[in-house]
């Protein structure tokens, strides 16, 4: 049914006819996400009519139908202005049972109505800056947080929980004030850590061989995204004893996530959100990644369970295959691994053994090949300085921040970017001294060492002198040509 | 007869091994000597690399050394404001407040009379008033059309601190100073068993013998280019834009017979300034044929290709390109702050409508 016909039916006001028109429109457009320009004015007119009814109150019998039409039209950018008003947003928030209002909502709310309103709010907040501002002013986050806290006590359908969390994600992603509010006033980290534990269903028997069901995966990912939003600009501060315990507990849940698989091909995505959040944990709380108890079949190195570090390394390997969105794909996992290696000698030694094993192949340049080392060295000259820096920093830390060792494994040419950024082009040793980690040379490396060009990091025969056979005068003449060039350059 | 060796044979084998080892060690000593040539145009960020080495490698500049840079900081600051005022005349830009014309006249008088290493309160006041003027700011925003030191805004925005009578330049202030380099500055440093000699080459024709010893057996050339130079308009005495000048030189050096097997480390510096500029000044100013978008990624990649494509020996000669921001010496606790915004944006992008 055309929007004009629906609008006409609305204006005539006959209830059954209106409901039928709306139902027909909804059926036809349930999967419409782009709209025909020709009917734009008709849709805007329909949106205005819907809003006027919405603001006065929808009749209980047909609420879901009306809200479905609003949801469909809220996908259309040209209709956003109509819906993004204080009254409309308040009405939708009331139906979603998240309005801060004086009058108590009749219990229990109709879950279908609640769900449709939440979907409308998600669409509006995602697409309309005005709606974002109004939602922040209306403090929708307060009631949303309250409801998330009730999941343990009352059973809400998966879809309601998911859209609660999605709306929380949108509000915290788009509004710094909401982020702060959830983090501080509403104790968001504690609240969402609790929700994550409930969703993972882990307490308290840790079993890494779990496959998280589809619905739980969806909810867990929303929680991880909200936690990311509210922690990324907050946890770099020093944390007190109590907060450290909370973040370490969150860390143990994230450790569990790293070791778990998600149903329906969503494992990498799930792990991606987990790793992003790990990167926001206070650095001193990353020790939880190495605190997994040793058990039958766990990967032990220097008396420490390396299952989690190994899983993160496997995740990095997978991510390095991608060319798309490289920065956000590899920077978080590299940062987490770098910090683990920086602070924990067993992790550093384990990672060095995996990523920078003793050099054997000294005939190939470090950036050539398919080993993890080669891929990471290639990133060291990447156009994106953030990507370049995380890759270089990771390898540098695995070399215990020893410049000679770093040059040995990557070549001075590749290393120059990090060394320049750190002011280490001429060596020097950083403040953070490492307990001296020894570096083993293979027989192959020792044999070839004299022929290795430190700049390229591979064996090269001594090139013939291009000036062979020239007289001193000729050499001087050639040199002066260069000097004139440099003179031009330095003016 | 078995495979046993007599005592004499054993001794001979040992001697032979020893000789081999000594030969190898001599070879290693020579091979482990790395000769670097540091090249780059006037404001390419080349000297910053050397200063940075000093700051971190030698525990920084001492307070005494920093004090010696005070005069350079003042000179850089005064020269910057003078360059902007002069350009206002050329670009026909008026002062926002007519009273500033008197300050401008006063500036030239006071600057001429200023004692090296001192800045009077009067001179500081004049500079401050001028720098705040809307006309001066408008002219500063067009600095690509004339020659202006990159650190102009850094010093001028910090005038209150710099003009204090007890001012001592910070490490960062020293990094920002600009002094014309002449001749050759040789730096030696050692990484374990690697002995590096770096020659920072200025343009002065000093005695010829010295040059030859500089160019023979170079392991790598560090070539610095300021990315942000791409949109600078030619000064009257120049034949080509600075970026093209750098490319022309890079071509000559990269393919020079003296450096047939010499790797090149190409530092494309000042990426922070470039990132800001590219939003306002299109890359076509420098490369009219450029058809990409004016985003940092695409534009920077294009410049990288322009330089790397000049290498005529791609199979045997390595070019290591690094995009850098030469004044960033902060040895930060490494976290991925730079990535967080991107993560949130992408998480949003992945959110569909319902």
């Amino acid at each position: 049914m055309e929007p004009r016909a629906v609008a006409d039916a609305l204006e005539t006001g006959e209830e059954d006819a209106v409901t039928e028109a709306l139902r027909s429109f909804n059926r036809e457009h349930s999967q419409s996400f782009t709209f025909d320009d020709a009917q734009q004015e008709d849709r805007k007119r329909l949106a205005k009519l819907l809003v006027s009814v919405l603001e006065q109150g929808l009749s209980p019998k047909h609420r879901v139908t009306w809200l479905q039409t609003i949801r469909i039209l809220s996908r259309d950018r040209s209709c956003l202005d109509s819906f993004a008003s204080r009254q409309s947003l308040h009405a939708l928030a009331c139906y979603a049972d998240i309005a801060i209002s004086e009058e108590p909502i009749p219990q229990p709310p109709d879950m279908d109505v609640l769900l449709e309103s939440l979907k409308c709010l998600c669409n509006l907040v995602l697409s309309s800056p005005t709606a974002q501002m109004l939602a922040a002013e209306a403090r929708l986050v307060v009631r949303l947080a309250e409801r998330v806290g009730l999941y343990r006590k009352r059973s809400y359908p998966h879809e309601v929980q998911f859209f609660d969390l999605r709306l929380l994600f949108l509000l915290t992603a788009l509004r710094t004030d909401v982020r702060q509010q959830l983090f501080q006033e509403l104790h968001g980290v504690r609240l969402l850590t609790d929700a994550l534990e409930l969703t993972l269903g882990v307490a308290p028997k840790e079993n890494p061989l779990v496959i998280l069901p589809a619905q739980e995966t969806e909810r867990a990912m929303e929680i991880l995204k909200v936690l990311f939003n509210i922690t990324y600009d907050s946890v770099k501060r020093e944390v007190d004893e109590e907060d450290a315990a909370l973040y370490r507990y969150l860390g143990t849940l994230l450790r569990h996530c790293v070791m778990a698989d998600a149903a329906g091909d969503r494992t990498e995505e799930f792990h991606g959100h987990t790793v992003n959040l790990l990167g926001n944990l206070p650095l001193k709380c990353l020790d939880v990644l190495l605190a997994l108890e040793l058990h039958e079949g766990s990967l032990e190195f220097m008396g420490v369970n390396m299952d989690v570090i190994n899983a993160l390394l496997a995740f990095l390997e997978k991510r390095l295959h991608q060319t798309h969105r490289l920065k956000e794909c590899v920077a978080p996992v590299l940062s987490v691994l770098t910090e683990c290696a920086r602070m924990h000698r067993p992790a550093r030694k384990f990672l060095k053994a995996q990523v920078l094993p003793p050099l054997r192949d000294v005939r190939t340049r470090p950036e050539v090949g398919d080993l993890l080392r080669n891929k990471l060295v290639r990133l060291m000259t990447h156009l994106d300085t953030d990507v370049k820096r995380v890759a270089a920093e990771f390898l540098f830390v695995l070399c215990s921040e020893s410049v000679p060792r770093f040059i040995k494994y990557t070549g001075y040419g590749n290393a120059a970017g990090l060394l320049a950024a750190r002011g280490l082009m001429a060596g020097g040793r950083p403040e953070g001294q490492y307990s001296e980690d020894e570096d083993t040379d293979t027989e192959e490396y020792r044999e070839a060492k004299a022929s290795i060009n430190p700049v390229t990091g591979r064996v090269e025969e001594k090139p013939p002198n291009p000036m062979e056979g020239m007289t001193e005068e000729q050499k001087e003449h050639e040199a002066m040509k260069l000097v004139n060039m440099f003179d031009k350059l330095s003016r | 007869m078995g495979c046993t060796l007599s005592a004499e044979d054993k001794a001979a084998v040992e001697r032979s091994k020893m000789i081999d080892r000594n030969l190898r060690e001599d070879g290693e000593k020579a091979a482990r000597e790395v000769k670097l040539l540091l090249l780059g145009a006037g404001e390419s960020g080349k000297s910053t690399i050397v200063k940075q080495m000093k700051i971190i490698h030698e525990a920084g500049y001492s307070e005494e050394e920093c004090k010696q840079y005070k005069a350079v900081v003042y000179s850089n600051t005064i020269q910057s404001i003078i360059a902007i005022i002069r350009a206002m005349g050329r670009l026909k830009i008026d002062f926002g407040d007519a009273a500033r014309a008197d300050d401008a006249r006063q500036l030239f008088v006071l600057a001429g009379a200023a004692e090296e290493g001192f800045m009077t309160a009067e001179l500081a006041g004049v500079i401050k008033r001028l720098w705040k003027d809307s006309g001066v700011q408008a002219c500063f925003n067009r600095s690509r059309e004339y020659q202006l030191n990159d650190s102009a805004a850094y010093y001028l925005n910090d005038l209150d601190r710099i003009a204090q009578p007890n001012y001592i330049p910070t490490q960062q202030d020293v990094l920002r100073t600009r002094v014309k380099t002449t001749g050759i500055v040789e730096t030696h440093f050692t990484f374990k068993d690697l002995h590096f000699k770096m020659f920072d080459v200025g343009g002065q024709r000093s005695e010829r013998k010295k040059w030859i010893h500089c160019f023979e057996g170079v392991t790598a050339i560090i070539f610095c280019v300021a990315l942000s130079d791409y949109d600078l308009v030619l000064a009257e005495d120049e034949e080509m834009n600075r970026m093209h000048e750098s490319m022309k030189l890079f071509d000559s050096i990269c393919n020079n017979k003296w450096f047939t097997d010499t790797s090149i480390i190409l530092f494309l510096n000042k990426k922070d300034l470039f990132e800001e500029k590219i939003k306002k000044s299109p890359l076509t100013i420098c490369y009219p044929e450029y058809a990409g978008s004016n985003t940092y990624e695409e534009a920077a990649a294009y410049i990288q290709c322009q330089f790397e494509d000049l290498n005529k020996r791609k199979d045997t000669k390595e070019i290591y390109t690094h995009f850098t921001c030469a004044t960033d010496t902060k040895n930060v606790q490494f976290v991925f702050d730079a990535v967080t915004d991107v993560i949130i944006k992408n998480n949003l992008k992945d959110c569909g409508l319902f």
Epitope: E241, Y249, T252, E293 | -
Partner: nanobody, 121 residues
Framework: QVQLVESEGGLVQPGGSLRLSCAAS????????MNWVRQAPGKGLEWVSR???????SYGDSVKGRFTISRDNAKNTLYLQMNSLVPEDTAVYYC???????????????RGQGTQVTVSS
Amino acid sequence: QVQLVESEGGLVQPGGSLRLSCAASGFTFKYYYMNWVRQAPGKGLEWVSRINQLGGTSYGDSVKGRFTISRDNAKNTLYLQMNSLVPEDTAVYYCARCPAGAACKVEYDYRGQGTQVTVSS
């Protein structure tokens, strides 16, 4: 304030069993690693067992295979099930918390008053 209260211990025959519990209050129990440690007459403190926030466990060599540590986060309670007891297990048993949610074996920040377990015929 943080409180850890162990249940009554007792006298047990060699080969017998005993279950200790520890009621925690004054902090968010589930955020912390918890331990059982013991002190035999005239000896120093000996670490017995540890449990992490999600139930992962580890044990001292002398009790491995005989003792089982567990926790109920909903009830804020830590347990130690002791089987096949031997006279060498005679000691005062303490329930102890690791600081700031970190893993630890010796540097506890709080421990209970202790409860006496005696294994004797």
